[in-house]
Interface confidence: medium
């Protein structure tokens, strides 16, 4: 089958890192500098991605694979393959149209990216606030006072029922 296929289409023999050059009788030619082909049988090579400005090179382009970028310090990647670099903020802040702003009371962000999220409402689970929330941290919920047996308040508090939440992007 491979032999039949190659007789019908000589380009199918061209491996990754080459292209089928119509200008040269469909000979397999190496990809020119700053280009690549990641699969065989390609009729053109793709231009390598260039990591410029706020992007920095994480992996150099080769004849068979594209360059990979990440972001310079103070920025983080967004999107597939680090399509964008977005400015970091401090914990306890979120990035708005006007720059980094502190989280409003009742919200928190424990990362340098993402948005401020509301504190957990412990009472919805019939619990009480064990540790107050801050701009940087969610509240920690614990048993409601009614759940504590007499004298329980003098011992080590129970483990939190819920870990501080992580702000999804």
């Amino acid at each position: 089958f491979e032999r039949t296929r190659s007789l019908q289409d000589p380009c199918s023999n061209c491996p990754a890192g080459t292209f089928c050059d119509n200008n040269r009788n469909q000979i397999c030619s190496p990809c020119p500098p700053n280009s690549f082909s990641s699969a065989g049988g390609q009729r053109t090579c793709d231009i390598c991605r260039q990591c410029k400005g706020v992007f920095r090179t994480r992996k150099e382009c080769s004849s068979t694979s594209n360059a990979e970028c990440d972001c310079t310090p103070g920025f983080h990647c967004l999107g597939a393959g680090c399509s964008m670099c977005e400015q970091d903020c401090k914990q306890g802040q979120e990035l708005t149209k006007k720059g980094c702003k502190d989280c409003c009371f009742g919200t928190f962000n424990d990362q340098k990216r993402g948005i401020c999220r509301p504190w957990t409402n412990c009472s919805l689970d019939g619990k009480s606030v064990l540790v107050n929330g801050t701009k940087e941290r969610d509240v920690v919920c614990g048993p409601s006072p009614a759940d504590l047996s007499p004298g329980a308040s003098s011992v080590t508090p129970p483990a939190p029922a819920r870990e501080p939440g992580h702000s999804p992007q």
């Epitope: 967004l78 999107g79 597939a80 979120e94 708005t96 990216r113 993402g114 948005i115 999804p168 992007q169």
Partner: nanobody
Framework: QVQLVESGGGLVQPGGSLRLSCSAS??????MFWYRQAPGKQREYVAH???????NYADSVTGRFTISRDNSKNTLYLQMNSLRAEDTAVYYC???????????WGQGTLVTVSS
């Protein structure tokens, strides 16, 4: 599991308009993206919007395309005006996971700009 379903693609004449929609199951309290892939080309970034309304666009669509979202309907939109032949592509909506280690994709909707 996040599911993203695009709609609104079709055939339109140069200079025309289309509005794409992306319906998301689950939480879209996150950054949402539009990407596109033209025939024989690599997938490219079009625009994104954050849950607090910040937007960003690729240079090639700035001033012509508008990204928006309706969090109450879990829906992302892309209003495309002054369409050109080079806008012909399959358009995908996408979102990152919380750690930006994975991107979730819809199945895409085809936009063809031709006279």
């Amino acid at each position: 599991q996040v599911q993203l379903v695009e709609s609104g693609g079709g055939l339109v004449q140069p200079g025309g308009s289309l509005r794409l929609s992306c319906s998301a199951s689950g939480d879209i309290f996150s950054i949402m993206f539009w990407y596109r892939q033209a025939p024989g080309k690599q997938r490219e970034y079009v625009a994104h919007i954050t849950s607090n309304g910040r937007t960003n666009y690729a240079d090639s669509v700035t001033g012509r395309f508008t990204i928006s979202r309706d969090n109450s309907k879990n829906t992302l939109y892309l209003q495309m005006n002054s369409l050109r032949a080079e806008d012909t592509a399959v358009y995908y909506c996408a979102r990152d996971d919380a750690t930006n280690t994975r991107t979730y994709w819809g199945q895409g909707t085809l936009v063809t700009v031709s006279s």
